[in-house]
């Protein structure tokens, strides 16, 4: 999906008002210096691409974040404020076999959510030069 035509300001507002708090809640008890940010993004569409990938694609050691509150809110925000996103997801859902995943918070998931926090912060500061 191409995130170029999303309403970035509405997504930013959703992040600032609620998604950010859910990410902090998920990471509670973890030191902010515990993980190094290794995933970066260069502009808002790229940031949303990376955010979608890290939030919804299973990775080794972190099977699923999709049932977390921040993930539910992220998917809803993309569906509401990114034209055509819903259709791509409806088609993907119908094509995909159902797999039930247990919610397990592993260190790998914490690291992944730490990366997400960095991507969201970068999304909110699109005019900053890449380090």
């Amino acid at each position: 999906y191409d995130f170029t035509n999303c309403d970035f300001e509405k997504i930013k507002a959703a992040y600032l008002s609620t998604i950010s708090k859910d990410l902090i809640t998920y990471m509670s008890g973890t030191k902010s210096t515990e993980f190094n940010n290794t995933v970066s993004c260069s502009n808002r569409p790229h940031c949303l691409t990376e955010i979608q990938s890290l939030t919804f694609n299973p990775t080794a050691g972190c099977a699923s974040l999709a049932k977390e509150m921040f993930a539910m809110k992220t998917k809803a925000a993309l569906a509401i404020w990114c034209p055509g996103y819903s259709e791509t997801q409806i088609n993907a859902t119908q094509a995909m076999k159902k797999r039930r995943k247990r919610k397990v918070t592993t260190n790998k998931c914490l690291e992944q959510v730490s990366q997400l926090q960095g991507l969201w912060r970068r999304f909110n500061r699109p005019l900053l030069k890449q380090q």
């Epitope: 999709a66 049932k67 509150m69 993930a71 539910m72 998917k75 997801q89 409806i90 859902t93 119908q94």
Partner: nanobody, 115 residues
Framework: EVQLVESGGGLVQPGGSLRLSCAAS????????MGWFRQAPGKEREFVSA???????YYADSVKGRFTISADNSKNTAYLQMNSLKPEDTAVYYC?????????WGQGTLVTVSS
């Protein structure tokens, strides 16, 4: 098995109001987010509103200020209060639930705004 059943649609004049209901079974309602999509004839399905268990809500620009989403956990029911309806609100309205949002779907309820 999760089932979502929408009701409350009908024919209403421009400027009128309707309240849609979505009764959910087969899930612990308060643990999930709920939302409403709509599909107008010949158009893509559009996500118009969502409500989350912490009370936060999202609205599409096209309905903000006119529609209000709410949920009653004790009744396992979500609502969409639609005020100041316009002809362009004519669509089949579907309720959906998080985390997936895109499955399962109910059968939908038709809202027609016409004079």
């Amino acid at each position: 098995e999760v089932q979502l059943v929408e009701s409350g649609g009908g024919l209403v004049q421009p400027g009128g109001s309707l309240r849609l209901s979505c009764a959910a079974s087969g899930l612990t309602f308060s643990r999930y987010a709920m939302g409403w999509f709509r599909q107008a004839p010949g158009k893509e399905r559009e996500f118009v509103s969502a409500i989350f268990s912490d009370g936060s809500t999202y609205y599409a620009d096209s309905v903000k200020g006119r529609f209000t989403i709410s949920a009653d956990n004790s009744k396992n029911t979500a609502y969409l209060q639609m005020n100041s309806l316009k002809p362009e609100d004519t669509a089949v309205y579907y309720c959906a639930r998080g985390p997936n949002w895109f499955d399962p779907w109910g059968q939908g309820t038709l809202v027609t705004v016409s004079s």
